[in-house]
Amino acid sequence: IVLRPSRVHNSEENTMRALTLKDILNGTFSYKTFFPNWISGQEYLHQSADNNIVLYNIETGQSYTILSNRTMKSVNASNYGLSPDRQFVYLESDYSKLWRYSYTATYYIYDLSNGEFVRGNELPRPIQYLCWSPVGSKLAYVYQNNIYLKQRPGDPPFQITFNGRENKIFNGIPDWVYEEEMLATKYALWWSPNGKFLAYAEFNDTDIPVIAYSYYGDEQYPRTINIPYPKAGAKNPVVRIFIIDTTYPAYVGPQEVPVPAMIASSDYYFSWLTWVTDERVCLQWLKRVQNVSVLSICDFREDWQTWDCPKTQEHIEESRTGWAGGFFVSTPVFSYDAISYYKIFSDKDGYKHIHYIKDTVENAIQITSGKWEAINIFRVTQDSLFYSSNEFEEYPGRRNIYRISIGSYPPSKKCVTCHLRKERCQYYTASFSDYAKYYALVCYGPGIPISTLHDGRTDQEIKILEENKELENALKNIQLPKEEIKKLEVDEITLWYKMILPPQFDRSKKYPLLIQVYGGPCSQSVRSVFAVNWISYLASKEGMVIALVDGRGTAFQGDKLLYAVYRKLGVYEVEDQITAVRKFIEMGFIDEKRIAIWGWSYGGYVSSLALASGTGLFKCGIAVAPVSSWEYYASVYTERFMGLPTKDDNLEHYKNSTVMARAEYFRNVDYLLIHGTADDNVHFQNSAQIAKALVNAQVDFQAMWYSDQNHGLSGLSTNHLYTHMTHFLKQCFSLSD
């Protein structure tokens, strides 16, 4: 299936050029998306090209600037947030990145009624997190690991927590492992729907072992970065959830929400919090052995001023074939009765589908079904449920948006996006206004991305929000590679792959092959999305064929494929890449002597193991920031898939699945090992141990480190990295510079 239109007129060929590495590094062909910042059923805010904050009313068609670029510039604001009562805007500046989601910033409050910044009782700096209440203009913020509340922006703050301590106690913000592996947010506090209550998590990291690494900087002595980071089997953070009444917070104080008894009996995690009403909250908990999850619905008892979580409102989700959920345990979407909810979990056939839970999970009503998966529930209204799935035409790497009418019986299903721009758009996400009155569709490809606005009742397209015209024009004289998404059937396993082919691809010729792999549990690489990136350049300019393969352990194709890797990471993911390579060779256009593999993070682990598989298939390969032993990686992630590194659990496979154990097998391949020294996620330790094992085995290899760079290798390091990898591959494939 050719997803990119091929050129028709040969006369065009002369004026067209291949992609260059510079194009990629400069982001010349990057695209834009448009996500409305919804503030009501029919209004949204958007930051214009000249940095004004503009309010759009869909129904009147009017728009006006609520905050000028002059005001933004006066405090060097890079972000903003309008209070729900529309009286104030917070302006965010001095952004300073911490980990994947977290950052600190300076905040200024601007009063829209008088056009002045709020003076007196200004916010401290830097703030770790700040947000408005959902109604009115109360502010909650986290400063130095403690939570503060302002009843009004000009008021003095009320301190809610007092025990916050750097690297020890975190209130309202997650510690490293919860941020990266559980919540995937920079915050751990949640307002109730009308702002009456504020729930927050407290993470106690006192007993967690600390990872320490040098940050070289510019000083005479490097400084040491210390992060409480639980590796597999280590002591974990202790989490507690509290709720405080924000009307009179100084009276009762924070009230702890009880943990379900079956969860509290051993090590556990808190996984998410969902407010249902102002006086009903839903908490999700997970055993440390992550195959049992409990959803607990708690009610406020006015007379006791406590939160009551009756056993009758505990819903257990258990997996017998793997871990609970997909990457994370799914979160519930409550219906209007404030007790029943919709949730995605595995059906009896092992496919993730939407279920409706009214009383017990056992009595759940299955809403979607089939040999495909429901991926996200966007919105539930009185009469409709909007969700995304990969059902359409049986392509797991697509995403379409569906509407199920839940107001009528039997419920009817309609694909909202399947036939809108069928060739251009096969991978969508959506953003809904209040009550789903309107929604934006963001199409990511396979054609050039486009964002559109739609009527929530009729699904009619109202207008194009962003169509990337400039990008379209810029690409007109570029020889883009061709892309195809197909599948291989091998031993009852379906291996979907994406192949990126040189523009003048000729099946009768032989091409060098580069496998790009990630392969982590519940990931998906073969997606129908648009991208002009490094591998596009390698195909366009350097004439390589690039392939991405989704093997066992990957997502959205059922539990059989997903949970195949349970407790044995590093086996089937590698086998399936090798199997695919053999099949590609059989296709006849791959030069068997010029096959390489590369990957980053989990992909670096898989590429390393593939290179050390002893198959003789790969001439060379690259591992960027690889995991080398699961004992070195974070507890929450690792144990989800591998269990514990103890004798009576899974220590044996922890030991067997290291890259170091296969050091001897690197002798006959060219290996490039790359890592940032300040990687907070996959620690440099991983590559240091690979290097040590290779040296001890007297195996030659190439390596590059990036001083003071984290897992993302950003900034100038990115340019250096891709230039370096390009040289390595061209040398490996005997391509002239």
């Epitope: 003095p156 009320f158 100084a250 924070p254």
Partner: antibody, heavy 116, light 108 residues
């Protein structure tokens, strides 16, 4: 009806110790943060300490390290263990329902006199 | 810590008269965290007003509170014989919670 009844006050020498108790009834004791407030002739009303239903404690700087607040939810009782007592700790000690404000119910108070 | 200064120290009035008691904070206090108490000799303090202006349960409507920022007022619209007592303002906006030194309302 909410009732708070303090006991344990008395005369003690400087450097000595005393343990105050407050028996609570008429409300779900375990749910509420409770405080000790004192009234001394020289200082007026002064907040001393608080303890949440779950046992988290808070102290005024003037008593930190010397006084320990605790509670027994099964007995509906609040305690204040006072060590290294000083003359300036002389006051009527009230137990009150509430964290920082408001204190909506107060006991009758118990007198602590620190004198040699 | 926040210092609360009450004025006047003593207020001499007759029953039926209006009493206006002032409480000034050394720094801004959010009205949500300002309370007033009444104390009679030999008795425990009694909560009158919380949140600067909300009457506690069972408090007659002749008692009212107002103010914001650093200036707060307790007003007793018509003094009754049982209203003669010491009145304290209190803030809980910042730890430690602090009380004013009190205003004594006495019979003239």
């Amino acid at each position: 009806e909410v009732q708070l009844l303090e006991s344990g006050g008395g005369l003690v020498q400087p450097g000595g110790s005393l343990r105050l108790s407050c028996a609570a009834s008429g409300f779900t004791f375990s749910s509420y943060t409770m405080s000790w407030v004192r009234r001394s002739p020289g200082k007026g009303l002064e907040w001393v300490s608080a303890i949440s239903g779950g046992g988290r404690t808070y102290y005024a700087d003037s008593v930190k390290g010397r006084f320990t607040i605790s509670r027994d939810n099964s007995k509906n009782t609040l305690y204040l263990q006072m060590n290294s007592l000083r003359a300036e700790d002389t006051a009527v000690y009230y137990c009150a329902k509430g964290w920082f404000t408001p204190f909506d119910y107060w006991g009758q108070g118990t007198l602590v006199t620190v004198s040699s | 810590e926040i210092v609360l200064t009450q004025s006047p120290g003593t207020l001499s009035l007759s029953p039926g008269e209006r009493a206006t008691l002032s409480c000034r904070a050394s720094q801004s206090v959010s009205s949500s965290y300002l309370a007033w108490y009444q104390q009679k000799p030999g008795q425990a303090p009694r909560l009158l007003i919380y949140g600067a202006s909300s009457r506690a349960t069972g408090i007659p409507d002749r008692f009212s509170g107002s103010g914001s920022g650093t200036d707060f007022t307790l007003t007793i619209s018509r003094l009754e014989p049982e209203d003669f007592a010491v009145y304290y303002c209190q803030q809980g906006n910042q730890i430690p919670p602090t009380f004013g030194q009190g205003t004594k309302v006495e019979i003239k």
